[in-house]
């Protein structure tokens, strides 16, 4: 029994003065609390808890029920508590079956013994089976059995408690243990899709998968800048114990230009948070962004290939695309694509190949785009580059010699006199007259430049080499001369 | 052994809300699920959301979303259940139950409130 | 929503029948199925989870099987005291039970 010095308040006296009594059931229970301010006894079992304000606690039949802790507290309130046993062959174990644990922590199977002097008290596996190998308790007569650090694994493991009473193993009612698992990691998140564009008055959806050990995780979807409180709806499933998912989805039936922006979806649980992003793009109406791959000014030799290519933003889908050449739509050499496989892409390729290029073959040609709200199209310039042609060279009745050659770019003509029967003309001569001929005429194809210089000037015999050159190579054509006397003859010109 | 004890019948309005309450005596109420499942005059049973009091956080049926609200109070070993905008068709008998989140069975019930709807 | 649907709505046995309840669900549940038996102005009372096991207490006249989306419970000899509806309820999604299946007296 407790003691204190004299003039300090003292706990209140029981008798019978022990800490453990054992009675058979149907016996008295008579605890007497001895104490001038007396209050009251109270006793306690499996959260059940009873009350009584004599100072004599007289139980007359007692039963297994009555095993328990019984206190008396004084009007200071100090307490002395004596733990009685009612000892029932027909019932060792009290029970309470629920049994819950948090992953990691200690939980107690409460099935406390009415005879404190059976051996052997333990837990086992229903139906036989071993209990987990890790699995680790501690015995208490009075409370029940202790199961340490309880695992996930553990979860709706059934058990007994068990004793050994005058030499036979006592099984108690099953027990199932449900475990709550601790969490370990942030949640998982994921969105349906990473961006979304719409027009006016189209409905947005998008959902937000969250996958976490438990169906207590918190989710929500939050419109960045913004408090307001967004509708979403949720599906949930559980694939199995400790793997839930829900799925939450915003919907915005008829969504407007300034519903635009970034969407959250964010997830928390005990261990920390997670969040994903969607962006909405709303337009009034659609439209269709042509970009150029190559220069809209293309330049090509004769006989090379040339491929036009443009990348394209349309939206919504394109519905037709051609490429047009002097007001005939190419029906083959060229193909159109997505830019990715992604659902949400808009951007397109388009290619036409254009193959063994003529020089008459130069000129616009243009791509075509349209979609249910607006048209585009975008015009290429090709120019073939083509090495100059002489169309012609005459002497003229008035003495000119004149050299007529057709090319792109525009060919420039040189003239050079050879004397006698040199092979290299290397005396320049200056032209009379230089005209381009076409140049106020189509815009693309070759063009025509006409050089002519006066005959008179050369005395002797010789050639006269007119030279037409551009960027794509040279061309050249020959006046011979021969003097009979005074008398100049021009001799048919050749190349 | 456990018991779920529920707060008495209630006479309410159209409009008007309805807070139910449910103490369990004993037990390791933290770690419960403690569901909320209603029965209207007889009708089948139909749950309407759960919380398990430790991590503090309401799961709810979507026919119910944004009108019903669950707590708990670990202190008293209390759950709550907060019908609002109540109409006519919500006169039912409202059952607190132990159970029904994360896959667990309800394997124990209140004796249910009658929550009685009318002008 | 994961549907419930029980079969038959109700039935009519005499005692020491043999009754068998049936349960459908509209999409898997593995084996997250539960029964209830609810008498009259009480609360329903849980006989058997996770489709086949038993809850302590319960007479093992009743048993559960079952898994995916068809279950059965089965009363191997009916007693005076299980005349009652019985529902079936899942798990596996937002909760959802059977419409129910009364036990009446032939």
């Known amino acids: 029994q407790p003691s204190v010095s004299p003039g300090e308040p003292s706990p209140p006296s029981i008798h019978p003065a022990k800490s453990e009594l054992i009675v058979r059931v149907g016996n008295e229970i008579r605890l007497l609390c001895i104490d001038p301010g007396f209050v009251k006894w109270t006793f306690e079992i499996l959260d059940e808890t009873n009350e009584n304000k004599q100072n004599e606690w007289i139980t007359e039949k007692a039963e297994a029920t009555n095993t328990g802790k019984y206190t008396c507290t004084n009007k200071h309130g100090l307490s002395s508590s004596i733990y009685v046993f009612v000892r029932d062959p027909a019932k060792l174990f009290l029970v309470d079956r629920s049994l819950y644990g948090k992953e990691d922590n200690d939980t107690l199977v409460r099935c406390p013994l009415t005879d404190p002097e059976v051996t052997s008290y333990s837990l086992k596996g229903c139906q036989g089976k071993p209990l987990p190998k890790d699995l680790r308790f501690v015995p208490d007569p009075k409370a029940g059995i202790t199961i340490k650090s309880v695992k996930r694994a553990y979860h709706r493991l059934c058990l007994h408690c068990s004793a050994d009473q005058e030499g036979k193993s006592v099984l108690s009612d099953k027990f199932i243990l449900k475990v709550r698992p601790a969490f370990k990691a942030v949640p998982v998140v994921s969105v349906s899709k990473a961006s979304y564009l719409l027009r006016e008055g189209e409905e947005f959806t998008v959902t937000c998968t969250i996958k976490d050990v438990s169906s207590s995780v918190y989710s929500t979807w939050k419109r960045e800048n913004s408090q307001t409180k967004l509708q979403e709806k949720y599906n949930s499933w559980h694939h199995g114990d400790f793997n839930y998912e829900r799925q939450a989805t915003l919907t915005i039936s008829s969504a407007r230009v300034n519903d635009s922006g970034v969407f959250m979806c964010y997830a928390n649980n005990t261990f920390g948070s997670a969040n994903v992003t969607t962006t909405l793009e709303v337009v009034d109406k659609g439209f269709i962004n042509i970009f150029p791959m190559i220069n809209t000014t293309v330049f090509v030799n004769d006989g090379e290939n040339v491929d036009l290519i443009v990348e394209y933003e349309a939206f919504p889908k394109p519905e037709h695309q051609q490429w047009i050449y002097m007001n005939r739509t190419f029906t083959d050499k060229w193909e159109d694509y997505p830019k990715s496989e992604n659902e949400s892409n808009i951007r397109y390729v388009s290619e036409l190949h254009l193959t063994r290029l003529k020089g008459t073959e130069g000129g616009t040609y243009t791509f075509l785009v349209s979609n249910s709200d607006v048209n585009a199209s975008i015009a290429f310039n090709v120019y073939v580059n083509t090495k100059p042609e002489i169309l012609t060279y005459d002497r003229l009745v008035n003495g000119m010699l004149q050299c007529v050659a057709a090319g792109f770019p525009e060919p420039t003509i040189d003239w050079y006199f050879c004397p006698g029967t040199e092979q290299r003309c290397s005396a320049s001569v200056l032209p009379v007259d230089v005209q381009t001929l076409n140049a106020s005429g189509p815009p693309f194809g070759k063009l025509v430049v006409q050089s002519s210089i006066d005959s008179s000037a050369f005395k002797h015999n010789g050639t006269v080499e007119c030279k037409a050159y551009n960027d794509v190579g040279k061309t050249s054509a020959y006046f011979n001369f021969a003097f009979k006397g005074n008398n100049k003859e021009q001799i048919h010109p050749h190349t | 052994q456990v018991q779920l004890v529920q707060s008495g019948a209630e006479v309410k309005k159209p409009g008007s809300s309805v807070k139910v309450s449910c103490k369990a005596s004993g037990g390791t109420f933290s770690l419960y699920a403690i569901s909320w499942v209603r029965q209207a005059p007889g009708q089948g049973l139909e749950w309407m959301g759960g919380i398990i009091p430790h991590f503090g956080l309401a799961n709810y049926a979507q026919k119910f979303q944004g009108r019903v609200t669950i707590t708990a109070d670990e202190s008293t070993s209390t759950a709550y259940m907060e019908l609002s905008s109540l109409r006519s068709e919500d006169t039912a008998v409202y059952y607190c139950?132990?159970?029904?989140?994360?896959?667990?069975?309800?394997?124990?019930w209140g004796r249910g409130t009658l929550v009685t709807v009318s002008s | 929503d994961i549907q419930m649907t029980q079969s038959p709505s109700s039935l009519s046995a005499s005692v020491g029948d043999r009754v068998t309840i049936t349960c459908r669900a509209s999409q898997s549940i593995n084996s997250y199925l539960n029964w209830y038996q609810q008498k009259p102005g009480k609360a329903p009372k849980l006989l058997i989870y996770a489709a086949s096991s038993l809850q302590s207490g319960v007479p093992s006249r009743f048993s559960g099987s079952g898994s995916g989306t068809d279950f059965t419970l089965t009363i191997s000899s009916l007693q005076p005291e299980d005349f009652a509806t019985y529902y079936c309820q899942q798990g596996v999604s937002d909760i959802t039970f059977g419409g129910g299946t009364k036990v009446e007296i032939k």
């Open positions: 139950a132990r159970g029904g989140l994360d896959t667990d069975e309800f394997d124990l």
